[in-house]
Structures are given as structure tokens and as C-alpha cells.
């Protein structure tokens, strides 16, 4: 059975208290009272004969929920130039910042803007970025697993796979690819035999940043990260 | 460069058996390792062991082969497979292959990506 | 380390898609190959690091992760697809019993 709408204001009934989402008891009165919507505040509250006057809030303020302010919140102060807008302000809702492209969100607002963006770290030579996050949002790095490099300086490469050669030149390590010799055209040729030489990676690399000074990143231990052992006997 | 097995035939249960790898084409050494694989006839692949190619003599071989099948580097290059006390649930082709190393693979014995197979050897056990 | 393959066998037209998939009992990173067998001959490495074609392999075959299954997936099938398709761990651990897994037949109609 549908609740009957009860107009605003009104007196309670002893045990009964006043809808909470959009209506408040005003102590005063001793009425129930009808808040105001979002975008809104209150302009005149109510007495026991007239309900809460409601105004528009004005340019750069705003409140977000059913409510019984006397003003309206101002808006967050605009986006810096290291961060993008992604919520504009409006008479119901708070201008949201979040950072550009290469940084993260080093200190947070409790609506969930960004108050300070941080350039992110870079992961020099012979290590990749994880696949999660610091608990900051910086970029983890992870030293290059077995049979993997990163010759890169880069917040956004990942540790790859070194190549494989039909006739290998100089075997990979952690920081570069392994190189392949010229193959002989008459090898092709050989029967009874299988062999492969360059990768085609199924998915898209990451593109190659251009390096910069790089700050010291957090270092992410994984399967087989232990840093790599150049020994002279495995060629160098 | 290729790689051909020799070795294989018929042979009694809880007889024993050598099964040579010979490289052509490319040098034993430590830019590669040779492992040994099998496949039971109509079935699957399995893996049987792997040795370094350079002169660490390195090896690791699938928790079921240790103390059975032993893997070694005969010369720069041959790798041999010697197999003892052979069973019915041994008869496979035996296939060679080879793995590209890197630098610092002996610390861990992987990744295994087998980037050329030799055509493989039939061994038969049976009575 | 055992690695689980599914299906066993699956049959698709000329132009359809195929999807094997393979299951590792343990967290073998992006340590994994695809091969390719047809009868008579050895295998042949189709992928390797989990998604990364070998020299010569058609674009036609991608492979994926997702933790510790694996995908391996060939579209606009051609007659020559025809074979037996392996997943390998590899990965080495000191439990590594079988680093294959069953294999799946891949009939082309």
C-alpha cells in the first residue's frame, strides 16, 4: 500500500518522526519541514503555518544533497594546469580535478578531487612497470623477470620478452634485447626442421617514452624479479 | 641448423638405452640449452629434461625422470639421454630441442620456449 | 606445475574461430608457449611469453592472459590449421611433473 504524502509542514505523530531524505524537524516550530533539493538552500526556513523558502544557489557554489543550509558550498578553487577537469561545477555538484596523463594523485580531497598531482616515477633500465599500483597510485617498478628487458626509462613500459633468434648473436639481459644474427637465406631450406627468429606481439608495446631525470621508484618484488647474475660462462 | 636424434629401436623392459642429440648448423655453447621431450604414440607431449649447452653442465629434469634418465653434454655437439630400467609406459618418440638462453639463465632455469625441434626418435619397449 | 587444456577436440568451418584454453595449477607469470603438432612431424613454437607471435606465425593466431589461464585463439580458420595445439609452461619449478598440457585437436570442416 503506497504512503500517503503528507504536505509539509506538519506535526508529527507522538512516536513518529519526520521523513529523513527530504524533510527535517524543525525544533523551533516543532514541525516537520521539507528540506531543499539539491541546488538549492534555504532561504527562509519554515514556521508552523509556511514551509522552508528555497533559493537557487549562486554561480560557484553548489550543495549535493536534500538539505537545510543556510548557503549553498563553494566550489573546489579551479583545476591547476597539471590536472584536467573531469566535473564542472554546477548548482548541484562540486568541481572535480583529477591529473593529467604521467602523474598521479598524491594527496586526495574527501569528495574525491585531487588537491596535488605528483609526476610519476620512472623505471630506469632493466626494470618494468607492474601491473598495480602503489597504494598512492605511483607507478611500482618490478626488475625484469627471466627472459624478459626493458631497455627504456619510462612510467608506462613493461618488462617484454627478449626476442628469439633463428641463430642468436648476443643473448638478452634484463636491460637489453636479445640480438640475431643474419639468417642465411639457405636455411629456410633445411628439412625436418623448426626454428622462429623476431617477435610479433599479439597485443600493442607500449610506446617508448622519452627519458627523464627519474625519481627513485618503489620496487615491486615478483615471481623471478631477483636482480639478474651476468655471469661470463652464460656468454656475457 | 638442425637438430636429429639417433639412438632409438626396440628394447626390453628394464633394459637401458643412450639416445644422442647432434647439432648442425650452430655451436653447443652457452647461448643455448638442449632439452629432451616425449610423446607417448597418440598422445601428449611431455617434458623429460634440459642441460645448459656451455660448459656450466648445468641440468634439471622433471620431478618423474630424476635418477632415471640422466641428461649430458657428450661434445660441442651432442647432447645424450641415457634411459635405464625402461618400462612399457616409456615407449615414445623422443624429440631434442633447443632453448635460447640469456644472460643469468643458469639462476633460474627458464622460461623453456623449445624454438627447434629435431624430427624425433621412436623408442619401443617391449618383450 | 599441471597444466589443464580445454577443450580436448573442437571442429569448426573454414573462416570460423577457435578458442583453446589452458589452466595452470600455479602462478607461472606470462611464461607460456602455444605450439602447433601435425602428424609425423615435431612441434612447432607458435607463441611464447604468453601473446607473442614467432617469425612466420599468421596474425590469424593471438594469444592472452588473464592470471593463470591462458587463451590461445585462431580466427578465419584455414585448412592448414588443421593439427594438434599444446600449451606449455615455461616456467620451471621444482614441481614441474608435465609442463604440456593435453593437447586439443583442432578439426577444420
Known amino acids: 500500500v503506497p504512503a500517503q504524502v503528507v504536505l509539509t509542514p506538519y506535526k508529527p505523530e507522538p512516536g513518529y518522526e519526520c521523513q529523513i531524505s527530504q524533510e527535517y524537524y524543525d525544533r523551533k516550530a516543532q514541525m516537520c519541514c521539507a528540506k531543499c533539493p539539491p541546488g538549492q538552500y534555504v532561504k527562509h526556513f519554515c514556521n508552523k503555518t509556511s514551509d522552508t523558502v528555497c533559493a537557487d544557489c549562486e554561480a560557484s557554489m553548489y550543495t549535493q544533497v536534500w538539505n537545510q543550509f543556510r548557503t549553498c558550498l563553494s566550489c573546489s578553487s579551479s583545476c591547476t594546469t597539471d590536472q584536467v577537469e573531469i566535473r564542472a561545477c554546477t548548482k548541484q555538484q562540486n568541481r572535480v580535478c583529477a591529473c593529467e596523463a604521467g602523474r598521479y594523485c598524491a594527496l586526495k580531497t574527501h569528495s574525491g578531487s585531487c588537491r596535488q598531482c605528483m609526476r610519476l616515477s620512472k623505471c630506469g633500465p632493466g626494470f618494468g612497470v607492474a601491473s598495480s599500483r602503489a597504494p598512492n597510485g605511483n607507478v611500482l617498478c618490478k626488475a625484469c623477470a627471466p627472459g624478459t628487458f626493458s631497455d627504456t626509462t619510462s612510467s608506462t613500459d613493461v618488462c617484454r620478452p627478449h626476442r628469439i633468434c633463428s641463430i642468436l648473436a648476443i643473448p638478452g639481459n634484463a636491460s637489453t634485447d636479445a640480438v640475431c644474427a643474419p639468417e642465411s637465406p639457405t636455411l629456410s631450406a633445411i628439412p625436418r626442421t623448426l626454428y622462429v627468429s623476431q617477435p610479433e606481439p599479439t597485443r600493442s608495446q607500449p610506446l617508448d617514452q622519452e627519458p627523464g631525470p627519474s625519481q627513485t621508484p618503489s620496487i615491486l618484488t615478483s615471481l623471478g624479479s631477483t636482480p639478474i647474475i651476468e655471469q661470463s660462462t652464460k656468454g656475457g | 641448423q638442425s637438430l636429429e636424434e639417433s639412438g632409438g629401436g626396440l628394447v626390453k623392459p628394464e633394459g637401458s638405452l643412450t639416445l644422442t642429440c647432434a647439432v648442425s648448423?650452430?655451436?653447443?655453447?652457452?647461448?643455448?640449452?638442449i632439452c629432451w621431450a616425449r610423446q607417448a604414440p597418440g598422445k601428449g607431449l611431455e617434458w623429460i629434461a634440459c642441460?645448459?649447452?656451455?660448459?656450466?653442465?648445468?641440468a634439471y629434469y622433471a620431478s618423474w625422470a630424476k635418477g632415471r634418465l640422466s641428461i649430458s653434454k657428450a661434445s660441442s655437439t651432442t647432447v645424450t639421454l641415457q634411459m635405464t630400467s625402461l618400462t612399457a609406459a616409456d615407449t615414445a618418440t623422443y624429440f631434442c630441442?633447443?632453448?635460447?638462453?640469456?644472460?643469468?639463465?643458469?639462476?633460474?632455469?627458464?622460461?623453456?620456449?623449445?624454438?627447434?625441434w629435431g624430427p624425433g626418435t621412436l623408442v619401443t619397449v617391449s618383450s | 606445475i599441471e597444466m589443464t587444456q580445454t577443450p580436448s577436440s573442437v571442429s569448426a568451418a573454414v573462416g570460423g574461430t577457435v578458442t583453446i584454453n589452458c589452466q595452470s595449477s600455479?602462478?607461472?607469470?606470462?611464461?607460456l608457449a602455444w605450439y602447433q603438432q601435425k602428424p609425423g612431424q615435431p612441434p612447432k613454437l607458435l607463441i611464447y611469453?604468453?601473446?607473442y607471435l614467432t617469425s612466420g606465425v599468421p596474425s590469424r593466431f593471438s594469444g592472452s592472459r588473464s592470471g593463470t589461464e591462458f587463451t590461445l585463439t585462431i580466427s578465419d580458420l584455414e585448412c592448414d590449421d588443421a593439427a594438434t595445439y599444446y600449451c606449455?609452461?615455461?616456467?620451471?619449478?621444482?614441481?614441474?611433473?608435465?609442463?604440456f598440457g593435453g593437447g586439443t585437436e583442432v578439426v577444420v570442416k
Open positions: 648448423g650452430f655451436d653447443l655453447n652457452s647461448y643455448y640449452w
Open positions: 630441442a633447443r632453448v635460447q638462453s640469456y644472460v643469468g639463465y643458469a639462476n633460474y632455469g627458464y622460461p623453456n620456449y623449445f624454438n627447434l
Open positions: 606449455q609452461s615455461a616456467y620451471y619449478s621444482s614441481s614441474a611433473d608435465n609442463t
Open positions: 642441460i645448459d649447452g656451455g660448459s656450466t653442465g648445468s
Open positions: 611469453h604468453a601473446s
Open positions: 600455479e602462478d607461472i607469470d606470462s611464461y
